[in-house]
Structure formats: C-alpha cells, structure tokens
Interface confidence: low
C-alpha cells in the first residue's frame, strides 16, 4: 500500500485580524495508526497549536468530526485571529508508540499572514512657526498594521512631495508594525490656506487610503510689509499720516507710533481685513498738528508681529513746508492727534 502523505493544499493564506483562519490538512491513508498534531513553526521550539488527543485549545476547532472511524480530514479553524498568530502552520502525523508517539510525516506547511489595518495617520508640524522660504519638517505616524508592506505618500495641496524619509519598525519580525515618515516642506507667502497631507495605503484598506492632515496656518508666519504715507487734510495745519500693515499672518500684532523716537501711542490690531490668500491687512493713522512743531518731525510706525522683533518704517514730516499760524509756537493742544484705526 502507498505510504501515507500529509497534504496541506494551501501554501499560504491571508486573514484579516478578527476573522477566523481555516488551515486545511488531509491524509491519504489511515495507516499507520496515530494522532495528528498542528504546530506553528518547525524544528526547535515549535509551538503546539492543536493536539487531537489531549490539551485545551479554546480558539481551535476541527472542521470535521475526528471521532468518525474513517476520517482523513484534519483541518482546523482558529478563531479571532490577531497579528500575533502569523506564522507557518504544520500538520504533523504521529505513529502510535510506547511510551511516546513518534513523528511520522509532516505537511509542507501553510503560511498564515494576518492583515491588520493601520491606525489613522497623525501628522504633526514644527513646534515653532516659520517664515516663507524656510524649510519645515512634518512627521506622520501610523501604527498597528500587518503585514509590513505599506505605502506612504505626502502631498501639499494635492501635489505629491518627494523630499521625505520613511521608516517601518521594527525591522524584523513583529506582531504588527509602525510607520514613521518625515517630510520637508518649503513655505511660501501663499501657504496660509495650504494643507499637508500624509496618505497611507495598505492591503487591508482595499484601495481606500487613510489620510492625516496638517494645516500650514498652524506653522507659517508671514511677516508684514509696512508703508507710511501722508495725506493733507482740510484743516490747513493738519496732516494725516497712515501706516499700512499688509499681508501678515497670524493676526497677533501690536503697533506703536513714535514721534522723534518717543512713544506716542500703542495699539493692538483689531478690525482686520482678510486677503484671499488668508493673510491680513490693517491700517493705523495719525492726525499731526504741524503748527505745534518748530522743527521737522520723524514719525515712526513700529510693528511687533506674533512676538517677533519689531519692524519699523519712518516718515519725515517737513514742518518748514507747512505755513505756520500766528503764535504757533505757543499753540495749545497736542502736537499729535490720535485717531482710531480704520
């Protein structure tokens, strides 16, 4: 009679975490007499998964009724699969012996791989804001997936980025894996409304990748441009001086007017106008009573934006160019009349 063969028809199977795995095994003969055992791994240290005769295996059930006299199907089903169950499973026939059974023949093995979904990617940016033209780093992390093969892409406003480095850990065997990627992004002045997206594709996601996003509004600081101008007003001895603060982000801004280096007024930006690109504009103005000045006046608009060192713009007001009222050197009242910002 032909010698017994142990047939494991599936070279490999892949199962999603939480599902059941069926491991098929049939034998071609009822001889020799002896039990079947299932192991994970081969050689030293193999792990017993199921023993036909004894032991408690709560997650393992047999597909066929092993008590039937002519049964030759020793397939098993393992319930509630987790990534820790991955490995190669062997169906092994033993020959009855005394005192111990003797291993007679092993199946070729079925490699079980477990598919576990990655967690939603978490994208984080730098701790401090940066200005346009600077390169900033974003990190993306996702955990708990299996198998190890995974694809990660970075996008900025739909455009794929190429400057990034990705690691999958651990390098060797693990029940599940984590991915960590760092992308470098060059900021531009138009990036207030921009988004950085980390996209993770994995076999468990059926072509519907997971995405994590970061808004560059949390990262960028666009410093303002200043322009100081003067317009005459109807009153002959008054000049309206305005400080236009343009294209800044975020909103936090404090403006100080200086007259010949001395603080005249400080105000905090309030009623801002928003530009299409997400930056803001603001204007502050002063009414200058020219008749109160004997000499030329240096007016400085000094702006402190988002806690950064102050930037300033000055304007020289030529007093000599304006007609003086009689007795203007003793004229009462302030030299500078402050006005609420527009």
């Amino acid at each position: 009679e032909e010698e017994l063969q142990v047939i494991q028809p599936d070279k490999s199977i892949s199962v999603a975490a939480g599902e059941s795995a069926t491991l098929h095994c049939t034998v071609t003969s009822l001889i020799p007499v002896g039990p079947i055992q299932w192991f994970r791994g081969a050689g030293p240290g193999r792990e017993l998964i199921y023993n036909q005769k004894e032991g408690h295996f709560p997650r393992v059930t047999t597909v066929s009724d092993l008590t039937k006299r002519n049964n030759m199907d020793f397939s098993i089903r393992i319930s509630n699969i987790t990534p820790a169950d991955a490995g190669t499973y062997y169906c092994v026939k033993f020959r009855k012996g005394s005192p111990d059974h003797v291993e007679f023949k092993s199946g070729a093995g079925t490699e079980l791989s477990v598919r576990a979904k990655p967690s939603a990617p978490v994208v984080s940016g730098p701790a401090a804001r940066a200005t346009p033209q600077h390169t900033v780093s974003f990190t993306c992390e996702s955990h708990g997936f299996s198998p190890r093969d995974i694809t990660l892409k970075w996008f900025k406003n739909g455009n794929e980025l190429s400057d990034f480095q990705t690691n999958v850990d651990p390098a060797g065997d693990s029940v599940s894996y984590s991915i960590h990627s760092t992308a470098k992004v060059v900021l531009t002045r138009e990036d207030v409304h921009s988004q950085v997206i980390c996209e993770v594709a994995h076999v468990t996601l059926q072509g519907d990748p997971l995405r994590g996003t970061a808004n560059l509004s949390e990262t960028i600081r666009v410093p303002p441009t200043l322009e100081v101008t003067q317009q005459p007003v109807r009153a002959e001895n008054q000049v309206n001086v305005t400080c236009q603060v343009r294209k800044f982000y975020p909103q936090r801004l404090q403006l100080t007017w200086l007259e010949n280096g001395n603080v005249s007024r400080t105000e905090t930006a309030s009623t801002l106008t928003e530009n299409k690109d997400g930056t803001y504009n603001w204007m502050s103005w002063l009414l200058v009573n020219v008749s109160a000045h004997r000499d030329d006046v240096k007016l400085t608009c000094q702006v402190e934006h988002d806690g950064q060192p102050a930037v300033s713009k000055s304007h020289d007001l030529k007093v000599s160019a304006h007609p003086k009222e009689q007795g203007s050197n003793t004229a009462p009242g302030p030299a500078l009349a402050s006005a609420a910002p527009l």
């Epitope: 994970r40 990534p83 820790a84 991955a86 651990p170 065997d173």
Partner: antibody, heavy 122, light 107 residues
Amino acid sequence: EVQLVQSGAEVVKPGASVKLSCKASGSTFTSYWMHWVKQAPGQGLEWIGAIYPVNSDTTYNQKFKGKATLTVDKSASTAYMELSSLRSEDTAVYYCTRSFYYSLDAAWFVYWGQGTLVTVSS
Amino acid sequence: DIQMTQSPSSLSASVGDRVTITCRASQDIGSRLNWLQQKPGKAPKRLIYATSSLDSGVPSRFSGSGSGTEFTLTISSLQPEDFATYYCLQYASSPFTFGGGTKVEIK
C-alpha cells in the same frame, strides 16, 4: 536541518575592508531576516543589523551605520557583511543568526553560524 | 534604544545549587525575550524564547519567567555542563539588544 555556515577567519590591515559570508541551508532562505552580531574579545554581544533577502530590506544599529554593509545573494542562499575602514576595535568574532519574518517567537535567534574571527593588525 | 541590564555580571556556584539571573529592560518588551548560553569559543545557543518557552533538547532545570521589564532565568540544580556565560536578548524593538552577560563559574 537548518545550518548557517560562515566563511573562515580573516587577518586584515587597518584601513582595509573585509567581506564575510553566511550560507544558509535546510530551509527557505528568503522568509527569514539574517542578522549579524559582533563579539569583541572577552566582551558581550552586540547586534549590528539585519537583511531580509526577499527584497534586500536592511536595518542597522546606528552604531554600525557606515561600518557594516549587508547584502544577499538569493540564488546562493548566502548573506554577506562587508566591514570597511577597519580599526583595531573591529577585531571580533562576527556571527550570523536568523529570525522569522512573521510573529513566530520560536524562530528568533535559534540558529547561529559558527562565527568568523576578524583580526585587524598591521 | 532599549537597554538590557543583566545582573549579576558573574557568580560562583556549586553543582546542585539553584541559580537565578535577572534582566531588566529599560521599557516594556512584553514577553519578547530570549535567554542564550555561550561556552568559550562557541556560538551562543538559545535556551529559552518568548520569556518562558524552553527550546527542544534543553533540560527542564532551566526555566524563564517575567514580563514587561523584569525577567528571570533560573537553573534549579546547577550541573557541570551549565558553567558558561548567559545572555538575555530582547527582540521587541530594533535595534535588538543583549544584556551584558552573566558568567557562571565553579565555586
């Protein structure tokens, strides 16, 4: 039976390079990570890095980056480690050992090569 | 990196003694720890995997226990062939790291 057979002892001059080999037999070579471990004379064991023959994916201990380069020849079931810019402190026995790709605790570092002694001397 | 601190670094014992070696991980490694035995001039040999599972052919006087960060290798009754150096090895996270070793010598 699984066997890892390593190349013979090497005596090399400082500044030179050496390439060690580790041939696997008795199992599917590609479904395991091949690791390399250093043991300096009278010292303990240090993990250098590992390579996965399926796609030549490598991982290194930061300490050995730039010192060790791991490669494989799948057709010959052989893993290689090249050590460069050798110095006296690289004198050691280098072992190859292997671990399973999936979560099979039983297959971690059970099989070891016999070791290759590298002596760096002028 | 995960640091593995092994103690003692050496010990003297007699045949028949009970010997305990401990290994502490700097962070949780679950049960992913091996114990290896190495004799002079030989490659390491794994005795225990996954903290407490005995390799086939390893005498039952060897046992392992612990989880998380604290692990123990126990030799219940030391035999002449057990005089060697023992290492713990974590394989939970790359880079994989070994303990510093414990040399078991004859008293």
